[in-house]
Structure formats: C-alpha cells, structure tokens
Interface confidence: medium
C-alpha cells in the first residue's frame, strides 16, 4: 500500500478515503514532493505582504513586502518598515547609525561626518545620526570681512571595515 502512495506525484496527495488514489490538491493548496498524504495550505500574502509568486499545485506562494517595507527572515517571514533617517538597512534589519556617522535619507547607508579640519575649517554645527556636521571658517578666517559658513563637503564613502 505504501508503494501506491509513493507513485503520487507533486501536485497530488494520496487519498486514503479513495483506496489510496492520487487526487489533485484542492484549490489553495499544494504538494511540492511526491508521495504526500495531504496537501499543504498555500501561504496568503496579506496586509504588508504582497504576492511575488502565485501558489500552484506544486509550489507555495512567495510573498514580498509592500512599498515602504522590506523583507526580514527566511522566505520573507516578516516585513519591517523601511529605515528612518539616522538608520541603515543591514542583514539584521534597521540599525541606528553609530556615533560619527549619519544618514539623512530613509534609504542608503550611514556615512562618516565630514572632517572639517581636512579642509582647514572648524565645526560650526555638530553632526547627529541624521545630519552631517556643518563646517565653518577656520579661526584664522574669523577676521572682519571673512566669508560666512560654507556648506558641508560631500560625504565621503564610509569605512565599512569592521575593526
């Protein structure tokens, strides 16, 4: 009798109520391997989930996240809201920027604050997790008639290297 069931292909189940005949999986269910005694219920992509791949008789549905969210966990088991300013997306989800770095966007990565001294300037406004520092004139430039604060230099590529 076991051998009869092993002949049932994916997309069917071995129906004990019908002398172990291979019956097709009912709607909204699937069997991805042969010889199954039951079909599994299809995953439903609802709420923050959206369907990436429809369920078929032989494979489960695959879900993705709606706009404004990203997948976390195996098989997109969770949807996490997109990161806020002051955070960056990593493999472990949204993480706050560390001291000395910032991200002023909802996407993207934390970048180091501009080093004002490299341009011979001083820090006019301190940086935060969400904002770069603002560089101002160097002390030597603070003589009468000197120009006011300059906009920050473009953010440099972060040193991602874990130390």
């Amino acid at each position: 009798l076991q051998d009869l069931c092993s002949n049932c292909p994916a997309g069917t189940f071995c129906d004990n109520n019908r002398s172990q005949i291979c019956s097709p999986c009912p709607p909204n269910s699937f069997s991805s391997a042969g010889g199954q005694r039951t079909c599994d219920i299809c995953r439903q992509c609802k709420g923050v989930f959206k369907t990436r791949k429809e369920c078929s008789s032989t494979s489960n549905a695959e879900c993705d996240c709606i706009s404004g969210y990203h997948c976390l966990g195996a098989e997109c088991s969770m949807c996490e809201q997109d990161c806020k300013q002051g955070q960056e997306l990593t493999k472990k989800g949204c993480k706050d920027c560390c001291f000395g770095t910032f991200n002023d966007q909802k996407r993207g990565i934390c970048r180091p604050w501009t080093n004002c001294s490299l341009d011979g300037k001083s820090v006019l406004v301190n940086g935060t997790k969400e904002r770069d520092v603002v560089c101002g004139p160097s002390p030597a430039d603070l003589s009468p008639g000197a120009s006011s604060a300059t906009p920050p230099a473009p953010a440099r590529e972060p040193g991602h290297s874990p130390q």
Partner: antibody, heavy 125, light 111 residues
C-alpha cells in the same frame, strides 16, 4: 594591516578531501557580518560557495555546494575554514576567502570589501 | 538565481564611454543590494560599487552604477588604460535564506 590569507590548496585526487583555511588579520570576528568563500575555475567567472556568520555561526550555502562543502570558524584564531569532500575535476579552481562589508554598527551589508589572494586547488589523478 | 551580464566581452579605446548591464532572474534584496567588482588576471576582485550606485572608497569617479530590482548598469565615463579588466556584478538575495550570486562577467579589452 587588514588582510585575509588563504592556505591549504594543492593537488588532490578525485574523491579526496581538502580543508582550506582563511586567516584574518587587522580585524576580529566578533560581529554579525559574514566570512565567505568564492571560487573561480581557470578562465571562468566567480562562483559563490557559501558564508558563515561570524557572530552566531549560521551558515549559508549555494545549492550545489550543500552536502560536499562545509564552512566553519574559530573566532579565537580569527580563522575560517572550508572543508571540501568528494572532490571532482570540476572543483579545480582558485578559492578565495572574502569578508562581507559591515555597517557602522557591525552588521552585514551584503557585499565583499576585502578579499584574500586565493589558493589554487587542483583535482586530478 | 541567474545573473546575466551583457556583453560578455567588449573592445574599446581609451576615452570611450563603456556600459555594462546586469540582469538578475529575481529582485535583489531591498531592490538595491547589488555590487560591482573589477578583476585583473591573477588578482582578487576589487569592489567598485555597492548598493547599486555608491562608489567604494578610492574608486575613481568615472565609474558609476545605476538600476533597481533586477536590472543594473555599470558605466565607465571615460575608459582609462588601467580599466581594461573583467567586471562582475554580485547580488544579495533573501529567499529561503541569505544567498549571494555573481554575474557571468564582462571582459573589457583594448580595441
């Protein structure tokens, strides 16, 4: 200096086994990013083998590598290993160790910012 | 997961604008977890671009990346002698688990 150095490559007979090592210096494995293995057959492209999370030890493998290839780590030695079993002629390649870039907070970012020089594995009788 | 680069090879001259495309069979994680690498013979790959469009440290600004989801482009605005090499895209994916894949490669040679 931050670097990765692979060792353990060489000539091995079909069906044999080999363990490659990747020693890291200039940084330590106490974070949640991955150390990975990538190979390149002569004249061919790059092929991802698998990775190990240096924090919790989770492993991820390419479907073709599961079963024959095993990645492990020894955080105290700052070393990652690639155990290769039942080797075949088509496994002949340069094997690279690569570090996944980490975020400012120490978490994996999905791309490789540091590579070793590679070690050649030749499978032949 | 298949990552197909085109062309597989191209010949160009110094000063040319070069464009390489990378197409993935499924979307990379968060639609932008895509990197580009340069590899020269006998050497390990070198990171050029990460997160689809961010220039890695020390990489000249003539390199740029764009794209989202499954379709990405690497552009070299003005090819220099040191740029003759093979280029690979690399995607990061989250399906049943984390998964990485490399493109088929594009070899850039002197015309």
């Amino acid at each position: 200096e931050v670097q990765l150095v692979e060792s353990g490559g060489g000539l091995v007979q079909p069906g044999g086994s080999l363990r490659l090592s990747c020693a890291a210096s200039g940084f330590s494995f106490n974070n949640d990013y991955d150390m990975c293995w990538v190979r390149q057959a002569p004249g061919k492209g790059l092929e991802w083998i698998g990775c190990i999370d240096t924090g919790d030890g989770s492993t991820y493998y390419a479907s073709w590598a599961k079963g024959r290839f095993t990645i492990s780590r020894d955080n105290s030695k700052n070393t990652v290993y690639l155990q290769m079993n039942s080797l075949r002629a088509e496994d002949t390649a340069v094997y690279y160790c690569a570090r996944e870039a980490a975020s400012s907070s120490g978490y994996g970012m999905g791309y490789f910012d540091l590579w070793g020089q590679g070690t050649l594995v030749t499978v032949s009788s | 997961i298949q990552m197909t680069q085109s062309p597989s090879s191209l010949s160009a001259s110094v000063g040319d604008r070069v464009t390489i495309t990378c197409q993935s069979s499924q979307s990379v994680y968060d639609n932008n977890w895509l990197a580009w690498y340069q590899q020269k013979p006998g050497k390990a790959p070198k990171l050029l671009i990460y997160r689809a469009s961010n220039l890695a440290s020390g990489v000249p600004s003539r390199f740029s990346g764009s794209g989202s989801g499954t379709d990405f482009t690497l552009t070299i605005s003005s090819l220099q002698p040191e740029d003759f090499a093979t280029y690979y895209c690399q995607g990061t994916y989250l399906s049943s688990n984390w998964y990485w894949a490399f493109g088929t490669g594009t070899k850039v040679t002197v015309l």
